[in-house]
């Protein structure tokens, strides 16, 4: 029988009263066959961390910081359950911190050295952790003590709990820097007065305080955000301007042999017995005998942490960077102008070897990290541990959703100006072969399918949103007989059909051969009766034009394509017999490294791009033999955006509607834990 | 295609050198880029340093200011100087030219490179 107990951890007397009581009203509502509680007193939350690494607790809720202490080694914990406010409806798990600043003032991000500085508190996350974590290595040397470097960097602060007598700058604005709120700058509402009344000219607090503090929009329009791209936006902007996004209150659990899932199904039970409003004798969100037992006071309820989140993500870039900063003390050398190496992201081994060899050629400008899949990428991007990569359209979406920035298009048709003149896209086409005469877009059920990879855009996102506007369901995999279409469940029928062997069977990358157009287009050729491609892909393994065996002797002319509306076309007909336009793949990367990828590729393309004429002896970008490697093989060039500079702009509101309708047929657990943050 | 064969490896002491080989059965002056690789056991394979035609190198940061690759083009062969070594060089090391295509894996038998006191 499983153990089906969870051991919660206590930090006091008080919490650990409230842990019997939650223990035995829980017995009293649930069967014997439930979940049950148990409880273990621990004398503080880093004794209660340890613990559960330990294995002799289960489950505790953190604050963010210590989140991100549970998270290092040898801890190794994980976000579960979040603790949400607001209402079920709208429920918040996040907040924003913010620099506030007034609309005439004129200066950015990176021009806050010499300003007057209003912070909530000396520790506090909003107003002290957060900012100066993210200024740390703008902090006049030596950093420590951290608060004289701070002194020293604005040129009058009000940090309440601050020691006026060793650093008075932190104090100047606030005579003593009282810790109450008999301070009348202190905690939220204290620093944006302290902004309000002209003392300071930034206030870093959390996003809701603007609102709390001024009820009327017209006064709220005379401040404005600080963004971390060095630009402002208005107040109501802070899901897209802020310095991090904080969860509230979260419970951690291991990471292996966690018990996820079974705390979730008690948390789950509890609020539904016990949560706000529903029971007089116990009350999960209420502390009787102290403050915030167990869970916040003011929570509302609890919401389960999608299981592909680690901690560096629940966290955020932002926040683990200002947090580890502060903790770490460490910067580069010397801050300088120059764009440190861009790290770019590798799919399995075969784009290692070509991007292994575009870092020797890049001397050093290029740096390679590789992943498994491509959403291991995105999350690598994400976290700071690799820059930048080219996505398929489908995975731009995705990577927008996870807060990514569109830098670069690729382009495929030659023109003069190809870097400044980003195309409007590609073609989604089905393909089909001529012998299969009767073949219509119509009657392609019981059919065997060829997919790119799921989620991409002329493999998956476009045909598969087609059929489900016909068929108003997810279940594709009944729809087909067989098929390959990399990235699905390894049991599924659109695996059946992949070549890949052993535990590459139907991975999304090159180790699987069926991978991708070229791979799709393949799966066509031996095996299946469509393929779900882009409109080059047939010219370009036709003709004698891809060299390996299976493709050396096809002819372009033994394929056709489906209209939708149930005829068939020649394939050079594309124009008038397609699926969709499709987005063009496109670089991706962080906002902060927005500018260096931009200038290093820009840079890079004019030395390894389509200029070169002899790819046999020279590195060339763009050319991997039809394997599309880190870059599609008939990229002309990588084109500016301009102010295409969103997911959303870059993909269209058509296309963004289409994956979006798509989402409840979605496989992605990097969109699910990404859409958690930011819904 | 060239075939490339390893040599030079063997057992060191921390702090020792070694110089490995890459003799390939062919002309390298047209091959773009030449590299060094390693693999130690259960770990994924890597990059350690590289040359390009023009000479241009690059390393590992692991290695760098211990190791130097190089080439003579008229011996048609690739060099690793490997100085002050440590335990955690201990691998196999393998030389390729990336001219065989990147999604078919070209490897030599490779050379033996072992740090032990």
């Known amino acids: 029988v499983p153990d089906k107990t969870v051991r919660w951890c206590a930090v006091s007397e008080h919490e650990a009263t409230k842990c019997q009581s939650f223990r035995d009203h829980m017995k009293s509502v649930i069967p014997s066959d439930g979940p049950s509680v148990a409880c273990v007193k621990k004398a503080s939350y880093l004794d209660c961390i340890r613990a559960i690494a330990a294995n002799e607790a289960d489950a505790v809720t953190l604050d963010a910081g210590l989140v991100y202490d549970a998270y290092l080694a040898p801890n190794n914990l994980k976000p579960v359950v979040a603790e949400f406010y607001g209402s079920k409806e709208d429920p918040q798990t996040f907040y924003y911190a913010v620099a506030v600043v007034k609309k005439d003032s004129g200066f950015q991000m990176n021009q806050l050295r010499g300003k007057k500085s209003c912070h909530t508190g000396l520790g506090r996350s909003a107003g002290w952790n957060i900012p100066i974590g993210l200024l740390y290595c703008d902090l006049p040397e030596p950093r420590k003590p951290l608060e004289k470097a701070v002194a020293n960097f604005f040129s009058g602060s009000c940090a309440p709990c601050a020691d006026g007598t060793d650093f008075p700058q932190l104090c100047q604005l606030c005579p003593g820097c009282g810790c109450s709120t008999l301070n009348q700058y202190f905690g939220y509402s204290g620093a944006f007065k302290c902004l309000k009344d002209g003392a300071g000219d930034v206030a870093f607090v959390k996003h809701s305080t603007i609102f709390e503090n001024l009820a009327n929009k017209a006064d709220r329009d005379q401040y404005e955000l600080l963004c971390l791209d060095n630009t402002r936006k208005p107040v109501d902007e802070y899901k897209d301007c802020h310095l991090a996004q904080v969860p509230s209150h979260t419970v951690v659990a291991r990471s292996m042999g966690g018990k996820e899932d079974l705390i979730w199904e008690l948390l789950n039970q509890a609020q539904e017995h016990f949560g706000k409003d529903k029971s007089k004798e116990f009350q999960l969100f209420s502390s009787p005998h102290g403050k915030d037992l167990l869970f916040k006071d003011s929570a509302h309820g609890f919401l389960k942490v999608p299981p592909r989140m680690d901690a560096k993500m629940y966290l955020g870039y932002e926040y683990v960077t200002a947090i580890r900063n502060l903790r770490e003390g460490t910067c580069p050398e010397a801050p300088t102008d120059e764009c440190k190496p861009v790290k770019w992201c590798a799919l399995s081994h075969h784009e290692r070897l070509k991007c292994d060899e575009w870092s020797v050629n890049s001397v050093g400008k290029i740096e390679c990290v590789s992943a498994e899949t491509t959403e291991d990428c995105i999350a690598k991007i994400m976290n700071g541990e690799a820059d930048a990569m080219s996505l398929d359209g489908g995975f731009v979406y995705i990577a927008g959703k996870c807060g990514l920035v569109p830098v670069l298009a690729e382009n495929y048709n030659k023109s003069d100006n190809c870097e400044d003149t980003p195309e409007a896209g590609y073609f989604a086409i089905a393909v089909v072969k001529k012998s299969a005469s009767d073949l219509t877009w119509d009657n392609l059920k019981g059919k065997k399918s060829c997919h790119t990879a799921v989620g991409r855009t002329a493999g998956w996102n476009i045909p598969m949103g087609l059929l489900y506007n016909k068929i108003n369901h997810c279940r594709f995999d009944e729809f087909f007989s067989e098929g390959c279409a990399p990235g699905s469940k390894k049991d599924s029928s659109l695996c059946k059909l992949c070549m890949g062997s052993g535990l590459n069977l139907c991975e999304p990358n090159n180790k699987e051969g069926y991978y991708g157009y070229t791979g799709a287009f393949r799966c066509l050729v031996e095996k299946g009766d469509v393929a779900f491609v882009k409109h080059q892909t047939v010219p370009q393994n036709t003709g004698g034009k891809n060299p390996d065996p299976w493709a050396k002797n096809l002819n372009e002319k033994d394929y056709e394509l489906l209209c939708l509306d149930g005829t068939r076309k020649p394939v050079e007909e594309y124009a008038n017999c397609h699926l969709a336009r499709a987005p063009n793949h496109a670089v991706v990367t962080r906002k902060d490294k927005e500018a260096c990828v931009h200038k290093i590729l820009r840079q890079q393309q004019h030395l390894f791009g389509s200029n070169v004429t002899d790819c046999s002896g020279n590195f060339c970008l763009f050319r991997s033999e039809t394997k599309d490697l880190l870059f599609r093989d008939d990229t002309v060039c990588l084109a500016k955006l301009h102010d295409r500079n969103t997911y959303e702009k870059y993909l269209g509101e058509e296309y963004v509607k289409a994956v979006g309708n798509l989402r409840k047929c979605s496989t992605s657990s990097l969109l699910e834990a990404c859409t958690f943050r930011r819904p | 295609q060239v075939q490339l064969v390893e040599s030079g490896g063997g057992l060191v002491q921390p702090g020792g050198s070694l110089r490995l080989s890459c003799a390939a059965s062919?002309?390298?002056?047209?091959?773009?880029?030449m590299a060094w690789y390693r693999q130690a056991p259960g770990k994924q394979r890597e990059l350690v340093a590289g040359i390009t035609r023009s000479g241009t190198t690059t390393y590992a940061g692991s290695v760098k200011g211990r190791f130097t690759i190089s080439r003579d083009n008229a011996k048609n062969t690739v060099y690793l100087q490997m100085n002050s070594l440590k335990p955690e060089d201990t691998a196999v090391y393998y030389c390729t030219d990336y001219s065989s295509s990147y999604y078919q894996d070209y490897w030599g038998q490779g050379t033996q490179v072992t740090v032990s006191s």
């Open positions: 062919g002309s390298i002056a047209s091959i773009n880029t």
